[in-house]
Amino acid sequence: SIPWNLERITPPRYRADEYQPPDGGSLVEVYLLDTSIQSDHREIEGRVMVTDFENVPEEDGTRFHRQASKCDSHGTHLAGVVSGRDAGVAKGASMRSLRVLNCQGKGTVSGTLIGLEFIRKSQLVQPVGPLVVLLPLAGGYSRVLNAACQRLARAGVVLVTAAGNFRDDACLYSPASAPEVITVGATNAQDQPVTLGTLGTNFGRCVDLFAPGEDIIGASSDCSTCFVSQSGTSQAAAHVAGIAAMMLSAEPELTLAELRQRLIHFSAKDVINEAWFPEDQRVLTPNLVAALPPSTHGAGWQLFCRTVWSAHSGPTRMATAVARCAPDEELLSCSSFSRSGKRRGERMEAQGGKLVCRAHNAFGGEGVYAIARCCLLPQANCSVHTAPPAEASMGTRVHCHQQGHVLTGCSSHWEVEDLGTHKPPVLRPRGQPNQCVGHREASIHASCCHAPGLECKVKEHGIPAPQEQVTVACEEGWTLTGCSALPGTSHVLGAYAVDNTCVVRSRDVSTTGSTSEGAVTAVAICCRSRHLAQASQELQ
Amino acid sequence: QEDEDGDYEELVLALRSEEDGLAEAPEHGTTATFHRCAKDPWRLPGTYVVVLKEETHLSQSERTARRLQAQAARRGYLTKILHVFHGLLPGFLVKMSGDLLELALKLPHVDYIEEDSSVFAQ
């Protein structure tokens, strides 16, 4: 007797006949930038404060007839999804609504900017607890809207936005494309991406995760006790705003980076049928459906990591792609991927006092992606150790020579156009887990980190015959920080991390034919933090 | 709303000396850029967000906005400052002809200018 969407986001330990997780986000204030709302609806009465902020364009069409219930429809439903008494996610959260969309659901970038500024000023005048801002709207890519979101996020506000309903790359829309914003796509009761008429949910690397967004029952502005089903990425974003409110209420000190990592960590993994997405977007789109954590506390001991894909480099010979971690995250490894297989590897380099992951395209290549592994590692001191191409036939090696530093990732970068085509494979010496080994004509980069209680180990999985994909996963309690392919396999397209699994992709063997160096080995570096685990136990 | 033409006349007089000199000229080598929505039907030409460089103070934002109005008035264009931003981004929202973009991009402190565009409920 509970709506499917609430059941879906509820971990099994809360699942009785009713959705009743502990606490309801009562320490958190959620700002909603949307249409006007029916604040006296039973679902939200007394829990939504309508601010006096209004910045909306005129409705289109001379014959447009303003009908209050229609004007309030979108905002009322979303307020209900976030905090509604009966069909809401965070039943204890208080909300404030700002009107930035008119009765036709249309607004402007400028109106939204002024709304975000209003929130910032309110926060400065009267600082409260954690703030979540829900932006259930989308427009074309906007540098200024993304910049405003970045500033607000850096002021400690959690922004959650709709990925967009255009069945398109979310990176082409704002605020969905803003890296600091938590961008949410929509799935249905079958965990399929939501189709909306001829369009549907947006996808791609700018989406952080998905959430229920089809046939979502919520407050209807038609009457004070009415309910209605609505669909869209706005509804999905409202679920995540509610989950964020619950998490922040349980742990008010969580930073945006910590919250995002937890949202990803507690999501249902690999349940979405990726065939719905365009082929070139499948690898970039996170296969994650949001869920509440199984308990409100006790996640702090975990080493959280996420994968961040860069934009595509473009096909020019010297093109590069850069993937960056959030300010509070550590870049623990860097890998690259090219659909054509023509790439010149990747390297970690300092940029503005922070490490970034840069991938290099090769001559004749269609372009590359850089893939950063971004982790939460308090008190970490990480550095990159580089070995230039070696003359010796045994290949290039580099290790973490500083006391107490452990290897978290390996990258390799080469100047020659087609490394490995005419070269015999390099054998990696066993029993040396703290070093990276690469082709003799490649420079090798080791990510070496020191952090209290950090320990890492290397795990490999090799397949002698050519395979399109080789994977190796870290076991329970360990987190994947590094993912790379052993050198010498020329047909490798690249390596990337999916959740806790390292994936090495090779060329379609059926088209390339079996090569002499057919073996593909995926190398995962798995880490854990004993310090975080101990700190967590002490707290409990 | 006050009589705008009266305001312009006053502003032109007030800013003539400042404008004719090189006070607050754009820093050498930095060029402000113009951005607009890639989706044509969503564009809202005639309204622009002028974003100023990060450390610009509110007083400088207001001065830059007034300067734009004065320079536009000298060229016979009517402009209207709809909002001055501060708190998140320094800058201002202006209603003006697209003909003035080149002029606006050369104003001191300007980082970039973005044409307003539509957003939609999702």
Epitope: S1, E18, Q20, K91, I217, C223, S224, T225, C226, F227 | -
Partner: antibody
């Protein structure tokens, strides 16, 4: 079959607090599909909704009575209660309890009142 | 609040006749209107909900129509057990009831 039964004193003095309890049998009060309502009918007059509550204790009241009304729920006893403070002769009425479909679960039926209790007459008099 | 006005206050008819009861709202209630029947000493019983939908177990002789501000309950052919008081109720904005129409035997 779900049944509701009102109970409480039939006579209350002016300025005192009227207290009634509704006991639900034949079904559980614990369900997000329903709210539980109090409605009254002064002798020879029409019906007036007083307020409603769900099993989690979430209430909403008639704005005209809000300052005097408290509705509470006791899921362990499958009961919900009404308290109306500072009563006057104008509060003399037959008080009904009723189930109200919340509308959250469409399969539970339309968002209206039913079934109802038989009603209990409360007279306010000194 | 939304005020519902029922007319007539009393309707005197014979069994077999057609009864037409009216309910007018002070502002639009869309189709969020219900009709209840109440017999002496009994609790009200839901007949029609959302203006025109018959509740479970209600005979086909009862029908509802209207939307916005004007609504009608029609009993196509009165049966002896239909003589009672009928109330309309809206839920567009919280809950209010009409003053009732008494259908009595002529």
């Amino acid at each position: 079959q779900l049944q509701l039964q009102e109970s409480g004193p039939g006579l209350v003095k002016p300025s005192e607090t009227l207290s009634l309890t509704c006991t639900v049998s034949g079904g559980s009060i614990v369900s997000s599909s329903y709210y539980w309502a109090w409605i009254r009918q002064p002798p020879g007059k029409g019906l007036e909704w007083i307020g409603s509550i769900n099993y989690k204790g979430s209430t909403y009241y008639n704005p005209s009575l809000k300052s005097r009304v408290t509705i509470s729920v006791d899921t362990s006893k499958n009961q919900f209660s009404l308290k109306l403070s500072s009563v006057t002769a104008a509060d003399t009425a037959v008080y009904y309890c009723a189930r109200e479909n919340s509308g959250v679960v469409p399969a539970a039926g339309p968002n209206w009142f039913g079934p109802w209790g038989q009603g209990t007459l409360v007279t306010v008099s000194s | 609040e939304i005020v519902l006005t029922q007319s007539p206050a009393t309707l005197s008819l014979s069994p077999g006749e057609r009864a037409t009861l009216s309910c007018r709202a002070s502002q639009s209630v869309s189709s969020y209107l219900a009709w209840y029947q109440q017999k002496p000493g009994q609790a009200p019983r839901l007949l029609i909900y959302d203006a025109s939908n018959r509740a479970t177990g209600i005979p086909a002789r009862f029908s509802g129509s209207g939307s916005g501000t004007d609504f009608t309950l029609t009993i196509s052919s009165l049966e002896p057990e239909d003589f009672a008081v009928y109330y309309c109720q809206q839920r567009r904005n919280w809950f209010t009831f009409g003053g009732g129409t008494k259908v009595e035997i002529k």
